[in-house]
């Protein structure tokens, strides 16, 4: 079948990195600069993606593969294929329309991107706070107070009624 196909279509012999040039008797011509063909038998080469402005080149375009972009330092990718860049913030902050803002009390963000999230409510799992939360870190929940009392059974007690200051979830 391959032989039959190549007799019918000389373009099928053109490898990746070339295109079948109709203007030159269908011979295989190399892709021009800033273009590529990732598969054989192509009648045109595709233009390479350009990494400009806030983007930087992660992988150069070659005759057989497209360029890949990421964001310059201080920024991170958003969207499919890093289609947009967004400013980083510090841990303990989130990006708002007014820029990077510290997380409100009771919330944290342990990354340079994304939003501040509420601390875990340990009491909902019948546990107590072992390590307090900060703007950068979630609380660490420990065993429930009942588990720590001498002679406590190993059966986990039911979750207590909600603690003051916590609304039911």
């Amino acid at each position: 079948f391959e032989r039959t196909r190549s007799l019918q279509d000389p373009c099928s012999n053109c490898p990746a990195g070339t295109f079948c040039d109709n203007n030159r008797n269908q011979i295989c011509s190399p892709c021009p600069p800033n273009s590529f063909s990732s598969a054989g038998g192509q009648r045109t080469c595709d233009i390479c993606r350009q990494c400009k402005g806030v983007f930087r080149t992660r992988k150069e375009c070659s005759s057989t593969s497209n360029a890949e972009c990421d964001c310059t330092p201080g920024f991170h990718c958003l969207g499919a294929g890093c289609s947009m860049c967004e400013q980083d913030c510090k841990q303990g902050q989130e990006l708002t329309k007014k820029g990077c803002k510290d997380c409100c009390f009771g919330t944290f963000n342990d990354q340079k991107r994304g939003i501040c999230r509420p601390w875990t409510n340990c009491s909902l799992d019948g546990k107590s706070v072992l390590v307090n939360g900060t703007k950068e870190r979630d609380v660490v929940c420990g065993p429930s107070p009942a588990d720590l009392s001498p002679g406590a059974s190993s059966v986990t007690p039911p979750a207590p009624a909600r603690e003051p200051g916590h609304s039911p979830q």
């Epitope: 595709d46 233009i47 402005g53 983007f55 969207g79 499919a80 294929g81 289609s83 860049c85």
Partner: antibody, heavy 116, light 107 residues
Framework: EVQLVQSGAEVKKPGSSVKVSCKAS????????ISWVRQAPGQGLEWMGD????????NYAQKFQGRVTMTRDTSTSTVYMDLSSLRSEDTAVYYC?????????WGQGTMVTVSS | AIRMTQSPSSLSASVGDRVTITCRAS??????LNWYQQKPGKAPKLLIY???SLQSGVPSRFSGSGSGTDFTLTISSLQPEDFATYYC?????????FGQGTKVDIK
């Protein structure tokens, strides 16, 4: 919140030049490019070129090469677009826009009228 | 330059209608396609980036899809404030280019 504030409307004679400014208020340009996009009356959007303010490097669409110059003043967080040899077809609203892979913040636009 | 072609050029629709606008690139642009809304006398507003990601603050009735050369903007239930002109734009290779626009007006 970062806003892009442009200079006011201009009326120019054919053959003259116009310089439109775009100032970042409430923030800085950061590492983003600032593009200039124009829109003739009743027409679509046309990209003219861009500049990365922190580097001062400009890149122009071929159609405007030789007629357009984009510059910046980092001390005032302002970019400028200078278009020379004006003709009637250059009558348009000129927008600056922050480019981070998409134009997410736009200036209010500057109407440039070219008329003898 | 990569040519962007939108269809239709204009359409008439009623509040509550589902509206679909298409955009075709003259060569593959992967998912580097943005959609904007423009109202008379105003600057364009970014709706969708990366073909399908909703820009912050944009209502969820707007959605985008597609990859390669064919893309779609869908408004699931048209609202009075959605009557405007919509543009696609490729951010794959300079010069960045826009479609000619699709005007959505009241039936």
């Amino acid at each position: 919140e970062v806003q892009l504030v442009q200079s006011g409307a201009e009326v120019k004679k054919p053959g003259s030049s116009v310089k439109v400014s775009c100032k970042a208020s409430g923030g800085t340009f950061s590492s983003y490019a600032i593009s200039w996009v124009r829109q003739a009356p009743g027409q679509g959007l046309e990209w003219m070129g861009d500049i990365v303010p922190i580097f001062g490097v400009a890149n122009y669409a071929q159609k405007f090469q030789g007629r357009v110059t984009m510059t910046r003043d980092t001390s005032t967080s302002t970019v400028y677009m200078d278009l020379s040899s004006l003709r009637s077809e250059d009558t348009a609203v000129y927008y600056c826009a922050r480019d981070r892979g998409a134009f997410d913040i736009w200036g209010q636009g500057t109407m440039v009228t070219v008329s003898s | 330059a990569i040519r962007m072609t939108q269809s239709p050029s204009s359409l008439s629709a009623s509040v509550g209608d589902r509206v679909t606008i298409t955009c075709r690139a003259s060569q593959t642009i992967s998912s580097y396609l943005n959609w904007y809304q423009q109202k008379p006398g105003k600057a364009p507003k970014l709706l969708i980036y990366g073909a399908s990601s909703l820009q912050s603050g944009v209502p969820s009735r707007f959605s985008g899809s597609g990859s390669g050369t064919d893309f779609t903007l869908t408004i699931s239930s048209l609202q009075p404030e959605d009557f405007a002109t919509y543009y696609c734009q490729q951010s794959y290779s300079t010069p960045w280019t826009f479609g000619q626009g699709t005007k959505v007006d009241i039936k």
